[in-house]
Interface confidence: medium
């Protein structure tokens, strides 16, 4: 705590200037007026403080809102921003999409810090939905964002803000988040053209069931293996190898350099070995001609 | 190991065609795709399109769409690139390789369009 | 005409580690698998890496590729002298139904 002592005659801060620089701490505490400070924030990021002389600003602005920090002198915190804790940020109500860009523009190039997850936090739920202007401002910042989302908070995601996902926001998301994407972007993109659609979708189809993909290989889309390697194992093993062959295209004969990983693995294993043998490709570990497939699944359901 | 050998340089006038080969050794032909890659004097490569032999269907950039015709023979494992109305500006060295990444290349084919 | 941008030259000492950035679009490099070729002059090209980051058997892992988004970048370190060339990334473009080049990027060894 830094001690209460009387400012020194002629050292009153009139304004927020360069010349705090030279003052020592307790010179801040007892000179610089909280309120004054309040009202010139935007100024304290142009003035190049040290670590401690921040921690005594911080402090003053404590004390000036033990409730929490207003809108108008959060906006134009600046470094200060990385003084506080995600206990501070708490109590703050953050509803200007201007405000959050700025407190993230100070963090950028950095991991999210427990902070900067506090406050979009905050900032979400203040809005009740993560909006296309929240998304296309989180993902610009933080490309992983969506992917660090629950399947639950996903749900909350408008289709209208799929429009603001990249391919690369997608890169870190698991299935089970793309189950709650997929059907939001297959609405989305519904009245686009088919390859403007395929474009679109493509990002999301590691969602897609298995009826979706037989429509696809309808379509001559031509899904590149890299696509197709993140599709769910469950939705691609009942494609027939035909229905493999079209939705591939020429891309097919990469099966062959991805026969040891799933689904590819997996698809294989439940295929015709003659079947896989039209392809060309050496594929091997088909079901042996003459062999009777029982679905179990079937089986089950009806006993 | 995978060989492919194309057909010899050609001088061509502007307003012809011209018809190159690929012919294919080593592997299997049919079920692996033959893509078509030029590359004029000086310049990058530029991809004109694919046919995958036992589909029978090619598909074009759409830049060479209506003036390149891709076709092949699998009884001889020979794929062909036949370009129309010639200007000097497809002077340039006409390649043929294998599979969706290029993995096989021919040796390339010089084709010269002047007047 | 060219979909994927490469910057035009890159150079490195010999030893030095140098990379070839990539960029692409949503609708070829972002889902999609990306390719590097490596190009000696007067030669056909030659397949350095194929989907992002696998290398052919004979190449040394000198040569190293990776993906970010809609971006792939070929790295090369002990830089050999051998190693000056032209390199060009390849990915495919589901928009066009195409396999799309960069405009290559000539590598010097100083």
């Known amino acids: 705590e830094v001690e209460k002592t009387a400012c020194p005659s002629g050292k009153k801060a009139r304004e927020i200037d360069e010349s705090l620089i030279f003052y020592k701490k307790w010179e801040l505490e007892a000179c610089v007026d909280a309120a004054l400070l309040a009202t010139q924030m935007d100024r304290v990021n142009a003035i190049p403080f040290t670590y401690e002389q921040l921690d005594v600003l911080k402090h003053k602005l404590d004390e000036l809102y033990p409730q929490g920090y207003p809108e108008s002198v959060i906006q134009h915190l600046g470094y200060l921003f990385l003084k506080m804790s995600p206990e501070d940020i708490r109590k703050w109500n953050v509803t200007s999409l201007e405000t959050l860009k700025a407190l993230l523009e100070v963090n950028k190039g950095h991991e999210m810090s427990p902070q900067v997850a506090t406050l979009i936090d905050r900032f979400v739920k203040g809005r009740g939905q993560l909006d296309k202007d929240t998304l296309d401002t989180l993902t610009a910042f933080y490309p992983g964002y969506l992917c660090s989302l629950s399947p639950e908070e996903l749900s909350s995601v408008p289709p209208s803000s799929i429009w603001a996902v990249r391919p690369q926001d997608l890169d870190t998301c698991d299935p089970r988040q793309l189950d709650v994407l997929y059907p939001k972007a297959r609405l989305a993109f519904q009245n686009m053209n088919g390859s403007e659609y395929f474009v679109k979708i493509q990002s999301f189809l590691g969602g897609a069931p298995t009826e979706d993909l037989k429509a696809l290989s309808q379509q001559n889309v031509s899904m590149d293996l890299a696509t197709f390697m993140k599709l769910r194992t469950d939705a691609v093993l009942p494609l027939t190898v035909a229905e493999v062959q079209k939705l591939l295209g020429p891309h097919v004969e990469g099966l062959k350099a991805e026969e040891r990983h799933r689904p590819v693995r997996d698809w294989i294993l439940r295929q015709r070995q003659d079947d896989l043998d039209t392809l060309g490709l050496g594929l091997q570990g088909g079901i042996p001609n003459g062999y009777l497939v029982l679905d179990l699944s079937m089986q089950e359901a009806l006993s | 190991q995978v060989q492919l050998v194309q057909s010899g340089a050609e001088v061509k006038k502007p307003g012809s065609s011209v018809k190159v080969s690929c012919k294919a050794s080593g592997g299997t032909f049919s079920n692996y795709s033959i893509s078509w890659v030029r590359q004029a004097p000086g310049q990058g490569l530029e991809w004109m399109g694919r046919?995958?032999?036992?589909?029978?269907?090619?598909n074009y950039a759409q830049k060479f769409q209506g003036r390149v015709t891709i076709t092949a023979d699998e009884s001889t494992s020979t794929a062909y690139m036949e370009l129309s109305s010639l200007r000097s500006e497809d002077t340039a060295v006409y390649y043929c390789?294998?599979?969706?990444?290029?993995?096989?290349w021919g040796q390339g084919t010089l084709v010269t369009v002047s007047s | 005409d060219i979909v994927l941008t490469q910057p035009p030259s890159v150079s490195g000492a010999p030893g030095q580690r140098v990379t070839i950035s990539c960029s692409g679009s949503s609708s070829n490099i972002g889902p999609n698998y990306v390719s590097w070729y490596q190009q000696l002059p007067g030669t056909a090209p030659k397949l350095l890496i194929h989907g992002n980051a696998n290398r052919p058997s004979g190449v040394p892992d000198r040569f190293s590729g990776s993906k970010s988004g809609t971006s792939a970048s070929l790295a090369i370190t002990g830089l050999q002298s051998e190693d000056e060339a032209d390199y060009y990334c390849q990915s495919y473009d589901f928009f066009t139904n195409s396999s799309v080049f960069g405009g290559g990027t000539k590598l010097t060894v100083l």
């Open positions: 046919i995958i032999p036992n589909f029978g269907t090619a």
């Open positions: 390789a294998r599979g969706i990444y290029f993995a096989f």
